[in-house]
Interface confidence: low
């Protein structure tokens, strides 16, 4: 028995004085405290406990259930206690069969003794299966058996308590671990949406996943800058063992433009926290803003393509698009289509592929697109650009040479003569007249320019040449004539068309 | 390479309803929009409905608003049309196609014939008076 100084409170005294006794099952247990402040034997085995005030405890028939720690306690809180087994061949073992162990920790396969004096106290797999090589155990007569540093391997693991009892294996009844995961990692969190775009009175209904290895995660939606409660709901599920996935669902039912903003989906465990963010976005209409991806004035050479492309946003999603021209809707030569594969795209792209472009054209291209709520158009301005053609070359009554040319950019008209046999023109002379004839008509045509000279100031015979030129090329038209005595006999126009 | 199967056509008198289905293979389904088109004997191709990715948004000719209704399960990769009310107008041979153009997740549904790559061999219904 413990010894203390005098004068000092000193812990209660027990008879018989050892620290452990071994009766057989049937036998009497006789426990005396011995203590002026004696308070209470108890006792403890397993989950059990039971108390006693009187300072004598005894058991008459001793069953291998009072297998345990008996304590007696004085008033000064001080205490002394005795192990007694109650040995009974028939239960080897007392067994709480619940196995919980934390991952990296260890824990305890209750399976205390009734015996002491078995041997190869330790653990074995059911169905004569190997425990897992790096198990570690300690056993423990009067606790159990200690499993040393948990592994998530180790989960649903079936094992029996084992002894040798003369010279046979004994097991206790079975035991499966069950293994709650330590969290190694923050929680995985993801959300279905990362934007949305609604009309006001539409709901708002977002969700997010939250993933970790059990379902101890905390979860939360919160809104950023507020402290407001959202409404979530949860589904849950178990994918294998160490495997679970959650679903909050957050909702508006009827968003309004003040409910635009961001929302955190918020997660954490012991290891860390995680966040996921959506931004709600809440128009009071639908859109359609159109942007150019060209110039919208385009000028383009005579038989030229050139692809008129515009890029727009449109919420709702656009129902109707046409490309149109001198009210006439293009049927085909045109696509439209999503700017991006994101599910909240709102971006859309139309081509007009015009080919082989014409003289005549040129004109006002307008796109035109709608959705539910608005329409929105957008016009481009195409001029094409054509080498002069002379329309007319001849000799008015007045004696005046005329040339009419036509292109676009307007046509420069220059007048050169020739004398006698020369090739080359250079002499140039100038214009009695110069006028644009259709400027007042729509500005995408070609524009038609009339020059005149007066023949009357040509004395010698030769050759006049009529040029007409813009940016895209020239053409030219020429009058042959020759003089017979004082007259001019013969005026013969012709042209020579040059690239 | 994507395999378009239309069944369900048949003969049907006026007023009466017929449903047709299109199984489709070979691509992700579920991606892209899908869309059934008609061809009458002499006339061109026409649009008759479509649907989008998720069946979220749908797009029915001026011709069959409020008599027809696409649907589509991605789970069995089938698109189907109900069509009610029939009128001998409607008879034409119903061709199914795959908007491989379109983008998942946009809800974009087109009638353009030309955005639609893939094509089924299409199933005849007959509309008598």
């Known amino acids: 028995q413990p010894s203390v100084s005098p004068g000092e409170p000193s812990p209660p005294s027990i008879h018989p004085g050892k620290s452990d006794l071994i009766v057989r099952v049937g036998d009497e247990i006789r426990l005396l405290c011995t203590d002026p402040g004696f308070v209470k034997w108890t006792f403890e085995i397993l989950d059990e406990t039971n108390e006693n005030k009187q300072n004598e405890w005894i058991t008459e028939k001793a069953e291998a259930t009072n297998t345990g720690k008996y304590t007696c306690t004085n008033k000064h809180g001080l205490s002394n206690s005795i192990y007694v087994f109650v040995r009974d061949p028939a239960k080897l073992f007392l067994v709480d069969r619940s196995l919980y162990g934390k991952e990296d920790n260890d824990t305890l396969v209750r399976c205390p003794l009734t015996d002491p004096e078995v041997t190869n106290y330790s653990l074995k797999g059911c169905q004569g299966k190997p425990l897992p090589k790096d198990l570690r155990f300690i056993p423990d007569p009067k606790a159990g058996i200690m499993i040393k540093s948990v592994k998530r391997a180790y989960h649903r693991l079936c094992l029996h308590c084992s002894v040798d009892q003369e010279g046979k294996s004994v097991l206790s009844e079975k035991f499966i671990l069950k293994v709650r995961p330590a969290f190694k990692a923050v929680p995985v969190v993801s959300v279905s949406k990362a934007s949305y775009l609604l009309r006001e009175g539409e709901e708002f209904t977002v969700t997010c996943t939250i993933k970790d290895v059990s379902s101890s995660v905390y979860s939360t939606w919160k809104r950023e800058n507020s402290q407001t409660k959202l409404q979530e709901k949860y589904n849950s599920w178990h994918h294998g063992d160490f495997n679970y996935e959650r679903q909050a669902t957050l909702t508006i039912s009827s968003a309004r433009v003040n409910d635009s903003g961001v929302f955190m989906c918020y997660a954490n465990n012991t290891f860390g926290s995680a966040n996921v963010t959506t931004t709600l976005e809440v128009v009071d209409k639908g859109f359609i803003n159109i942007f150019p991806m060209i110039n919208t004035t385009v000028f383009v050479n005579d038989g030229e393509n050139v692809d008129l492309i515009v890029e727009y946003e449109a919420f709702p999603k656009p129902e109707h698009q046409q490309w149109i021209y001198m009210n006439r809707t293009f049927t085909d030569k045109w696509e439209d289509y999503p700017k991006s594969e994101n599910e909240s795209n709102i971006r859309y792209v139309s081509e007009l592929h015009l080919t082989r472009l014409k003289g005549t054209e040129g004109g006002t291209y307008t796109f035109l697109v709608s959705n539910s709520d608005v329409n929105a158009a957008i016009a481009f301005n195409v001029y094409v650009n054509t080498k002069p053609e002379i329309l007319t070359y001849d000799r008015l009554v007045n004696g005046m040479l005329q040339c009419v040319a036509a292109g676009f950019p307007e046509p420069t008209i220059d007048w050169y003569f020739c004398p006698g046999t020369e090739q080359r023109c250079s002499a140039s002379v100038l214009p009695v007249d110069v006028q644009t004839l259709n400027s007042s008509g729509p500005p995408f045509g070609k524009l038609v320019v009339q020059s005149s000279i007066d023949s009357s100031a040509f004395k010698h015979n030769g050759t006049v040449e009529c040029k007409a030129y813009n940016d895209v090329g020239k053409t030219s038209a020429y009058f042959n004539f020759a003089f017979k005595g004082n007259n001019k006999e013969q005026i013969h126009p012709h042209t020579l068309f040059t690239p | 390479q994507v395999h378009l199967v239309e069944s369900g056509g048949g003969l049907v008198q006026a007023g009466g309803s017929l449903g047709l289905s299109c199984a489709a293979s070979g691509h992700t389904f579920s991606n892209y929009a899908m869309g059934w088109f008609r061809q009458a004997p002499g006339k061109e191709r026409e649009f008759v409905a479509a649907?989008?990715?998720?069946?979220?948004?749908?797009l029915y000719a001026d011709s069959v608003k409020g008599r027809f209704t696409i649907s589509r399960d991605n789970g069995e990769n089938t698109v189907y049309l109900q069509m009610n009310s029939l009128k001998p107008e409607d008879t034409a041979v119903y061709y199914c196609?795959?908007?491989?153009?379109?983008?998942?997740?946009?809800?974009?549904?087109?009638?353009?014939?030309?955005?639609?790559?893939?094509w089924g061999q299409g199933t005849l219904v007959t509309v008598s008076s």
């Open positions: 649907i989008s990715w998720s069946g979220g948004s749908t």
């Open positions: 196609a795959l908007d491989s153009t379109g983008v998942y997740g946009t809800g974009y549904v087109s009638s353009r014939k030309g955005r639609y790559e893939y």
